[in-house]
């Protein structure tokens, strides 16, 4: 068989995956007492089941909805920070800021942070050579179809003040193709979510600009408008103060702008 | 079951065209990147054209860039490649695939000949 059929445009799987997902079970549901009755052997079967032996461009959310229902965690959903584009910065704010959450704070997000992996139609192998990629292949892969489900997930758990961490060195701010913008957004429940509030991150040392006024800030202040959701927007002008301030909140320097 | 109908082959002189169709059944067509390929007599397959499942992207071989052009229905379940400025290199059977699935149609034959 030439070698060509089974090559995908995206990196295969990332190696030693059964191994890291397991370890990351363990070590996760080690450190939150709230996941201890968690099974890792049951998960990591139940993972392994959503895309193993299935042709990777044909994965539904149902595939995964074993794996979600062992996953199954509850945050306080007043406390959810969503990002796009910018996941370092969310993920070093939660490590301070302990009482909010990303995606990537869950059981489900930690156990697929940054892993690549799919399978082969009819064999029960692991693909380590080569993954579908999401625009040159297809959409339907066991990665992208694992993110929209927990994302769809999280953001349907989402209350009150939700927040979301928006990268303001980008072309668009607001991507309305990222996940956040096609997925989170709109799952959002306006019977349950106040306001969106987003926080624009600047990139420059003396960018000074408001970027709460940029059109894709304006456009997702519209698509959340139209949910009946409110919606507000901060300039972060320096990301490193505002994650000291967060560190420090009684720093004299903190209670000017950041 | 999976099944795969090519078409549209046929005899053709140096410098002319054709379109080849191949439609697909017992799957969810728009799911699948597609690709075709091509046998020429005495010789292996090989690689001529790949799309993704939505149509968006699109691959060549470098023997046929900017001669071919491959496109896809997914209302229709259908693939096509569209063949301009034929050369008798091109002669051979032409199959079209589903990425990552064994099954194979019956092919169709492209004659380049005056």
């Known amino acids: 068989v030439p070698r060509w059929r089974q090559q995908w445009s995206g990196p295969g799987t990332t190696k030693r995956f059964p191994e890291t997902v397991l370890a990351r079970c363990v070590k996760y549901t080690e450190i939150h007492p709230e996941m201890r009755h968690v099974d890792c052997q049951s998960v990591w079967d139940a993972f392994k089941g959503a895309f193993i032996s299935k042709h990777p461009c044909n994965i539904t959310e149902e595939d995964y909805q074993p794996l979600m229902k062992l996953g199954t965690q509850t945050v306080p959903c007043n406390k959810i920070l969503l990002w796009s584009r910018i996941k370092d910065l969310a993920h070093q704010f939660t490590q301070v800021q302990r009482d909010m959450f990303t995606l990537e704070d869950t059981l489900l997000g930690y156990l697929a942070d940054d892993l690549t992996w799919c399978g082969e139609f009819n064999t029960s192998k692991i693909n380590y050579q080569s993954c579908p990629d999401w625009r040159k292949d297809c959409s339907n892969n066991p990665v992208s179809v694992f993110w929209k489900t927990v994302s769809r997930r999280f953001a349907e758990a989402a209350c009150d003040v939700v927040h979301v961490m928006l990268n303001g060195s980008r072309s668009k701010i607001f991507d309305k193709n990222s996940t956040f913008g096609s997925v989170e957004v709109h799952n959002l429940q306006p019977e349950k979510v106040q306001t969106l509030e987003a926080w624009v991150i600047h990139g420059g040392r003396e960018d000074s600009r408001d970027l709460c006024q940029d059109p894709t800030i304006k456009e997702l202040e519209s698509i959340i408008s139209k949910r009946n959701i409110q919606f507000s927007c901060k300039n972060i002008y320096r990301p490193d103060k505002f994650l000291q301030c967060v560190k420090n909140p009684e720093d004299s320097s903190c209670t000017s702008e950041i | 079951d999976v099944q795969l109908v090519e078409s549209g082959g046929g005899l053709v002189q140096p410098g002319g065209s054709l379109r080849l169709s191949c439609v697909a059944s017992g799957l969810t067509f728009s799911s699948y990147p597609m690709m075709w390929v091509r046998q020429a007599p005495g010789k292996g397959l090989e690689w001529v054209s790949r799309i993704s499942d939505s149509g968006g992207y699109t691959n060549y071989d470098d023997s046929v860039k900017g001669r071919f052009t491959i496109s896809r229905d997914n209302a229709k379940n259908t693939l096509y490649l569209q063949m301009n400025s034929l050369t008798p290199e091109d002669t051979a059977v032409y199959y079209c695939?589903?990425?990552?699935?064994?099954?194979t149609g019956q092919g169709t034959q492209v004659t380049v000949s005056s």
């Open positions: 695939r589903i990425l990552g699935l064994p099954t």
